[in-house]
Amino acid sequence: LQDPCSNCPAGTFCDNNRNQICSPCPPNSFSSAGGQRTCDICRQCKGVFRTRKECSSTSNAECDCTPGFHCLGAGCSMCEQDCKQGQELTKKGCKDCCFGTFNDQKRGICRPWTNCSLDGKSVLVNGTKERDVVCGPSPADLSPGASSVTPPAPAREPGH
């Protein structure tokens, strides 16, 4: 025998108190699938959270973060304070990156500059708190006489 509740569409619940008829979800609640025996409470985007998508009878609300904060976690479950480029967020707030590290975003941690010498390359542009170093050709490529390009032979003058 088919469960009568399976006929209840999204946006309703199967009301056992009313002979298993399909009742619409109460305000501020939703059911995203059919056949549910209760609706779910809508997520409320309060405080640092901002409503990105309103709750409807068939789908939950979606939140993002107010300016100066960014989402963390699945479905923006947390909002974390932004920092400036060249900083990272610590327990005591935003702190400048230590020498030898950088952060080119408003979130995340300071990361060490690339060690060019590990790849046998030289530093072309020094790193800053906001930017990684730029590695250039290897020192051997820059030494005199090491060039693989043969200079053109001098042109002979006519008649010689």
């Epitope: 619940f13 009301d15 108190n17 009313r18 009742s23 979800c25 109460p26 305000p27 501020n28 609640s29 025996r37 209760t38 609706c39 779910d40 409470i41």
Partner: nanobody
Framework: EVQLLESGGGLVQPGGSLRLSCAAS????????VGWVRQAPGKGLEWVSA????????YYAESVKGRFTISRDNAKNTLYLQMSSLRAEDTAVYYC???????????????RGQGTQVTVSS
């Protein structure tokens, strides 16, 4: 035991007004999320209005916004629905409803009363 007793319905001409009452017992209307649902002839239930978050916010269906007003009298433990500028499409049985929050996070509602019939016709 939770009981809800609706009254105040009747026959009214288009553009007219009615005030529905819901006398509650077995719970306190000021401490619960409560509202009104209706069922038009041959149609399913529809939420009309509710007082949510213990009075922190009110809800109105788009079809009744600006025409219906929900309120309550805590001393009388009674919920009201003031209906004005009534239209033929407001014809329905109106039920008082108590929103029920379940331990597992689910939401349903009780409509224990018999409802009160509102007929809008000339």
């Amino acid at each position: 035991e939770v009981q809800l007793l609706e009254s105040g319905g009747g026959l009214v001409q288009p553009g007219g007004s009615l005030r529905l009452s819901c006398a509650a017992s077995g719970f306190t209307v000021s401490a619960e999320d409560v509202g009104w649902v209706r069922q038009a002839p041959g149609k399913g239930l529809e939420w009309v209005s509710a007082i949510l978050d213990r009075g922190g916010s009110t809800y109105y269906a788009e079809s009744v916004k600006g025409r219906f007003t929900i309120s309550r009298d805590n001393a009388k433990n009674t919920l009201y629905l003031q209906m004005s500028s009534l239209r033929a499409e407001d014809t329905a049985v109106y039920y008082c409803a108590r929103v029920v929050y379940h331990a597992g996070g689910g939401v349903t509602y009780d409509t224990r009363g018999q409802g009160t019939q509102v007929t809008v016709s000339s």
